[in-house]
Amino acid sequence: VPLSRTVRCTCISISNQPVNPRSLEKLEIIPASQFCPRVEIIATMKKKGEKRCLNPESKAIKNLLKAVSKERSKRSP
C-alpha cells in the first residue's frame, strides 16, 4: 500500500454515483476496525479493473448493496 499513514484506511475520496450491479466485478465491505474507524465499501469494476470507494451513507449505494445481496441470495441454494 503506497500511502504511509498511522491510520490504515483505504478510501481517500468516496463516490455517491450509482453503480450498475452488472458492471461490478467485486464488491468489498470492510467493517470498521482498530485500523480504520469507519466502514469502507470498495467496488471493483469490470472495465479496466477500476476500484472505486463508495459512500456507505448514500441512498444509491445502499440500494446497490440491497440489489447485490438479493442477487447473491438468488444464486445460493
Epitope: P2, V7, C11, I12, N16, K48
Partner: antibody
C-alpha cells in the same frame, strides 16, 4: 459551480509561519480527499500534501515533512495548510486540488478540480 | 523514490499535427496510479487522463493515454491552437507519495 478558492498567501520572512486556506463550494466537500500542490516561479509542479475525506489519511512530501501540516474543517468546507519554519525555497504559487471521486490507495482518479492559487513569497 | 522523466523537454509542432509525449518512470508504476495534466501560462493545471488511459470528464477524444510498467505516452492526435501548453505526468504510490514529472512544453512551430 464547483470551485476552490485559496487565500492566506503573502510575503513572509524566513523562519516565520503562514496559514493557507482553501474554501470549497459547489460540491460535497466532506466526500473528497484534498491536496496542496505548489509551483515555484518558472518551475514545474510539486505535490505538497494530501488529506483524506474524513481527515484520517494524511501524507506529506519529504521537503515539507515536519514543517507543514494539512488539516480540514468539513463543517466550514475549508482546507488548511499550516506552514512553519518557512524557507526561501518554499516561495511558490500554492494550489489546492480535489482528489477524484472514489479514489483509494488502490486506484487514483487524479486531481480533478483546482483552485487558481495563492502566492507565498519567503524573503528577508 | 520513483522519479519521472518526461521527453522531449520541448516539442515544436504546427496545428493539425500529432503530438507524442513520453513519461518514463525509474521503477515500474501501476497504470492505476498514472495521470496526465495540461497547464497553460497563468492558469491552474487541468486533469486530462487518469489510470494511464481513461479520459477525465470533458476532455476531447483527441487526447489519449497509453502505456504500462515504466513507459507511458500521452498522444494528441491533431493539435488544436488551444492545446499548446505544458503537459505533466504524475504518479501516485511512492515517497514522496505523489510525484510530478518535469513537464513537456508543446509550442507552436
Amino acid at each position: 459551480q464547483v470551485q476552490l478558492v485559496e487565500s492566506g498567501g503573502g510575503v513572509v520572512q524566513p523562519g516565520r509561519s503562514l496559514r493557507l486556506s482553501c474554501t470549497a463550494s459547489g460540491f460535497t466537500f466532506s466526500d473528497y480527499g484534498m491536496h496542496w500542490v505548489r509551483q515555484a516561479p518558472g518551475k514545474g509542479l510539486e505535490w505538497v500534501a494530501v488529506i483524506g475525506y474524513g481527515g484520517l489519511i494524511k501524507g506529506y512530501a519529504d521537503s515539507v515533512k515536519g514543517r507543514f501540516t494539512i488539516s480540514r474543517d468539513n463543517s466550514k468546507n475549508t482546507l488548511y495548510l499550516q506552514m512553519n519554519s518557512l524557507r526561501a525555497e518554499d516561495t511558490a504559487v500554492y494550489y489546492c486540488a480535489r482528489e477524484g471521486a472514489g479514489s483509494s490507495v488502490y486506484y487514483y482518479y487524479g486531481m480533478d478540480v483546482w483552485g487558481q492559487g495563492t502566492t507565498v513569497t519567503v524573503s528577508s | 523514490e520513483i522519479v519521472l522523466t518526461q521527453s522531449p523537454g520541448t516539442l515544436s509542432l504546427s496545428p493539425g499535427e500529432r503530438a507524442t509525449l513520453s513519461c518514463r518512470a525509474s521503477q515500474s508504476v501501476s497504470s492505476s496510479y498514472l495521470a496526465w495534466y495540461q497547464q497553460k501560462p497563468g492558469q491552474a493545471p487541468r486533469l486530462l487522463i487518469y489510470g494511464a488511459s481513461s479520459r477525465a470528464t470533458g476532455i476531447p477524444d483527441r487526447f489519449s493515454g497509453s502505456g504500462s510498467g515504466t513507459d507511458f505516452t500521452l498522444t494528441i492526435s491533431r493539435l488544436e491552437p488551444e492545446d499548446f501548453a505544458v503537459y505533466y505526468c504524475q504518479q501516485y504510490g511512492s515517497s514522496p507519495i505523489f510525484t510530478f514529472g518535469p513537464g513537456t512544453k508543446v509550442d507552436i512551430k
